[in-house]
């Protein structure tokens, strides 16, 4: 109630001889500050004197002086809230009640604190969880109801007398609520810790033993088992017997059931500590263990690997990369169940032994078409040789091989023929699905791999084909060697280089651009008449009569070809001039007489000149000389001269006779 002083401190403090006591303490006085403080040991109230009797351990006066013998006890408080005390060292006879006599100006109070000082350091107390299971982390607690600033201590954990490796966490409390030192150790006990002694040892600052507490661990765990096998290496041959024994080395609590497992699966009707396997087969190879259960759970022994040895079983071949592309690499793997593992292998390709191949894997660095086929193997171990299995098929894919373009026609091929070609190949994998031809043309392919060229051209020289599967293989081009009649036959003048004049030496050449076969014959023709059989037609001295239309023919075994007609033109001076008279060479005076200068000339006469019987040129220059009216005086001999670019020609004299008319005669 409100008439009480309020104190807070631990109810009892514990220590031992020679240690110290630190008493955390707070208070609140009823009024004002503390004026007087006395620490009694076992105080008793004297009703007569109305004062407390007892040993005074500490006394503070108004002037704050403390007698020198009171140095062992220290008041660490103040005048209004802190009443903390320290006794150092503390003695056995300090046990009992401590009385804190507090006085203020108007109020007094006696506060009692119990002090328990033992002769020797008292042991700490180990606290364990209610149940400990293997591999489950637990916290072990070691608690000592002591802590004092002036007397450092340490708590150490030991397992079977050996310091524990795990790190402990030590904490201290020096509060008005509690005074203690505590060490906590996190620990995952194993089954092997069952029954072991754990110690918490109290030591002074130098590690000197002061006291301890011990507990025996009760670690709940599944049964711990040992498996024994006969024969000890667990390696047997088919038909042998095997015995396995299961021994329980530890179980907490006691075990309840036993079973056996092979490769993790429980074996039926095997519920004893001994497993007998009679006349084992290879199927009984595997990992065996026994399983024993208790309330914690099942425990399993280590596995025993029972190896039932046997000769290799029929082998199979695994091919890495089939189908394989020619030139690539391929690996073969021989798979055969055997125990022990095969030490030697024999490989076969299409039934024939592959020399020098004795390993589980065969690697072919560059696959070729002839590597295709069936690969099989035989495995061998110490117990014998296996059988050859069915093998595996290697498919080697490659472009078509030895592709050729073949001309189906009888030879020779003539221009205009229909030519049939086929594209042949030796082998192909996968099969050929299409063909290509070079050069491209508007040709028909009547069937796969056949090309038909209708009306073959003279200039169809070479053709190549390709046979294609996933790849195309081209054949070497084949020459069609088309035969044809001579082509582009024409007449060409070799000499003279300029125009031909009468009397010149003239050579004409019969040209052609090509002929197959090359052997040819020539023919020259003029107006349907054969002139010669050489490639040239020669005129030593050309005459105007040689002019005309010439053709040459060239023929070979295929046919003949004519040139276009070529006109030979001979230039010559006017010749064969004559003067013709119309209406005749006798004309009556007064009539009209026409003289014509006729000539043969190439080019035609460009200029005429007329002469009379006196060789006097007349003032007329056209082909015709017209006398109208004609006079008797015109009678006489006339001649003409014709001129062209080549030269001049003159006619012989022609006489004109002009006779008198009847009228003139009548007048005479």
């Amino acid at each position: 109630d409100s008439s009480k002083w309020v104190f807070e401190h631990p109810e009892t403090l514990y220590a031992w001889e020679g240690a110290c006591v630190w008493i955390p303490c707070t208070y609140r006085a009823l009024d004002g500050d503390l004026e007087s403080f006395i620490l009694f040991h076992n105080p008793e109230y004297n009703k007569n004197t109305s004062k407390f009797d007892g040993t005074r351990l500490y006394e503070s006066t108004k002037d704050g002086k403390v007698p020198s013998e009171q140095k062992r006890v220290q008041f660490l408080g103040d005048k209004n809230k802190n009443c903390t005390l320290s006794i150092h060292p503390v003695h056995l006879n300090d046990s009992g009640q401590l009385g804190l006599r507090m006085e203020s100006k108007t109020e007094k109070w006696m506060e009692r604190i119990h002090l328990n000082v033992s002769e020797r350091p008292f042991p700490p107390h180990i606290q364990l969880p209610p149940e400990i299971q293997e591999s489950q982390e637990v916290t072990l607690t070691c608690l000592l109801n002591f802590s004092c600033y002036g007397y450092p201590i340490q708590l150490q954990w030991l397992l079977e007398g050996v310091p524990m490796r795990q790190a402990a966490v030590t904490s201290t409390s020096l509060t008005i609520k509690s005074v203690f030192t505590r060490s906590e150790l996190k620990f995952s006990p194993q089954w092997s810790h069952h029954g072991k002694i754990v110690t918490c040892q109290l030591q002074d600052a130098d590690g000197k033993f002061l006291s301890n507490d011990t507990v025996q661990l009760n670690v709940k765990h599944t049964p711990k088992l040992e498996i024994k096998v006969t024969p000890s290496d667990a390696i047997v041959r088919e038909g042998d017997s095997v015995t396995m024994t299961c021994e329980v080395s530890s179980s907490n609590p006691e075990y309840t059931t036993v079973s056996w497992l092979k490769d993790g699966t429980s074996l039926k009707k095997q519920n004893t500590f001994t497993l007998n396997l009679r006349e084992v087969t290879k199927d009984q190879s595997g990992k065996y263990c026994c399983q024993v259960s208790n309330d914690v759970g099942p425990g399993r022994s280590e596995e025993v690997f029972l190896q039932v040895q046997y000769a290799p079983e029929p082998s199979t071949v695994q091919i890495l990369h089939s189908p394989a592309v020619e030139g690539s690499q391929v690996e073969f793997l021989c798979m055969s169940l055997a125990n022990p593992l095969p030490t030697n292998y024999t490989w076969y390709h299409n039934g024939k032994e592959m020399q020098g191949r004795t390993e589980e894997k065969v690697h072919i660095p560059k696959i070729l078409p002839w590597h295709a086929g069936t690969y099989s193997c035989v495995a061998e171990n110490i117990l014998g040789t296996g059988q050859r299995g069915p093998g595996a098929e290697l498919d080697v894919q490659y472009p078509p091989k030895k592709v050729t373009t073949v001309i189906q026609n009888p030879m020779p091929i003539r221009e205009g023929d229909t030519v049939t070609l086929s594209c042949n190949y030796n082998s192909s994998n996968p099969s050929v699905t299409r063909y290509e031809w070079k050069p491209h043309g508007a040709w028909e392919e009547p069937s796969l791999g056949v090309l038909k060229i209708q009306n073959v051209g003279w200039d169809n020289t070479t053709i190549a084909c390709a046979a294609c599967n996933s790849w195309c293989s081209w054949a070497s081009p084949v020459a069609l060697n088309v035969q044809y009649a001579p082509r582009d036959v024409r007449v060409r003048k070799i000499k003279p280089l300029s125009e031909i004049h009468s009397g010149n030496s003239v050579s004409l050449q019969c040209d052609f651009s090509s002929s197959h076969p090359k052997e040819v014959q020539f023919f020259w023709e003029k107006n349907g008449r054969l002139l010669g059989k050489e490639s040239q037609l020669n005129f030593d001295s050309i005459s105007p009569e040689d002019a005309g239309s010439y053709s040459c023919w060239v023929n070979n075994s295929i046919g003949q070809t004519a040139s276009k007609a070529w006109t030979l033109e001979v230039l010559y001076a006017p010749r064969r001039l004559r003067v013709s008279m119309s209406p005749g060479d006798q004309v009556m005076e007064g009539k009209s007489a026409t003289l014509t200068c006729e000539s043969d000339a190439n080019p035609p006469v460009s200029h005429y000149t007329w002469f009379d019987w006196n060789n006097q040129s007349l003032p007329y220059h056209s082909q015709k000389l017209r006398l109208e009216p004609v006079k008797v005086q015109h009678s006489g001999a006339y001649w003409c001269q014709g001129t062209n670019s080549v030269g001049k020609g003159r006619s012989p004299l022609s006489t004109l006779t002009v006779y008198y008319s009847p009228e003139t005669i009548g007048r005479r």
Partner: antibody, heavy 124, light 110 residues
């Protein structure tokens, strides 16, 4: 009968490109399983494989020289070529070409037939 | 790059058996190294003897055989003849390139 014949410039200067030709007869590089390789031998020393080429145009090069080497073939002319760029005196050697073949019925390759070599001197 | 090591020289007598070995610096020689053995006779006359570790090239006498002995490739001449006096080179395949050994000079004392 299989024969191989190497030809080269005989002598060339540092930094030039060495061009070698291997002309062969008795087999074709269009035939499956056929290859031609180049090997050199500096005077008094061992053999150094340079490169080889297979019928299917697969090419392999000595890693230490790869950046300088080019191997090629002309199947129709039965020739294989090797170019070595930026030569120096260390490239002085006898250069051999050899057929590398996988004969019919075999699974591995052989350096079975060799040329007689051509001597190349790199000199400043 | 790997180094391929061979005995520098071996001496034998006619009719004797001699074994040449070929070691790889990268570890054990396996069948995947496709060991090849090549014979060099005077005047740069080279002939391929063995391919793929243990396969004789066509036309090679049966006295030449290839094998793996321990971690090395080996060439055995069973019943050596005087004409077998030569330098023998091995070549090992490393995934994408060959490396030749330094060669073993075999002397057949007649």
């Amino acid at each position: 009968q299989v024969t191989l014949k190497e030809s080269g410039p005989g002598i060339l200067q540092p930094s030039q490109t060495l061009s070698l030709t291997c002309s062969f007869s008795g087999f074709s590089l269009s035939t499956s399983g056929m290859g031609v390789g180049w090997i050199r031998q500096p005077s008094g020393k061992g053999l150094e494989w340079l490169a080889h080429i297979w019928w299917d145009d697969d090419e392999y090069y000595n890693p230490a020289l790869k950046s300088r080497l080019t191997i090629s073939k002309d199947t129709s002319k039965n020739q294989v070529f090797l170019k070595i760029a930026n030569v120096d005196t260390a490239d002085t050697a006898t250069y051999y070409c050899a057929r590398i073949s996988i004969p019919y019925g075999y699974y591995d390759w052989f350096f079975d037939v060799w040329g007689t070599g051509t001597t190349v001197t790199v000199s400043a | 790059q790997a180094v391929v090591t061979q005995e520098s020289a071996l001496t034998t007598s006619p009719g004797e058996t001699v074994t040449l070995t070929c070691r790889s610096s990268t570890g054990a020689v396996t069948t995947r190294n496709y060991a090849n053995w090549v014979q060099e006779k005077p005047d740069h006359l080279f002939t391929g003897l063995i391919g793929g570790t243990n396969n004789r090239a066509p036309g090679v006498p049966a006295r030449f055989s290839g094998s793996l002995i321990g971690d090395k490739a080996a060439l055995t001449i069973t019943g050596a003849q005087t004409e077998d006096e030569a330098i023998y080179f091995c070549a090992l395949w490393y995934s994408n390139h060959f490396i030749f050994g330094s060669g073993t000079k075999v002397t057949v004392l007649g």
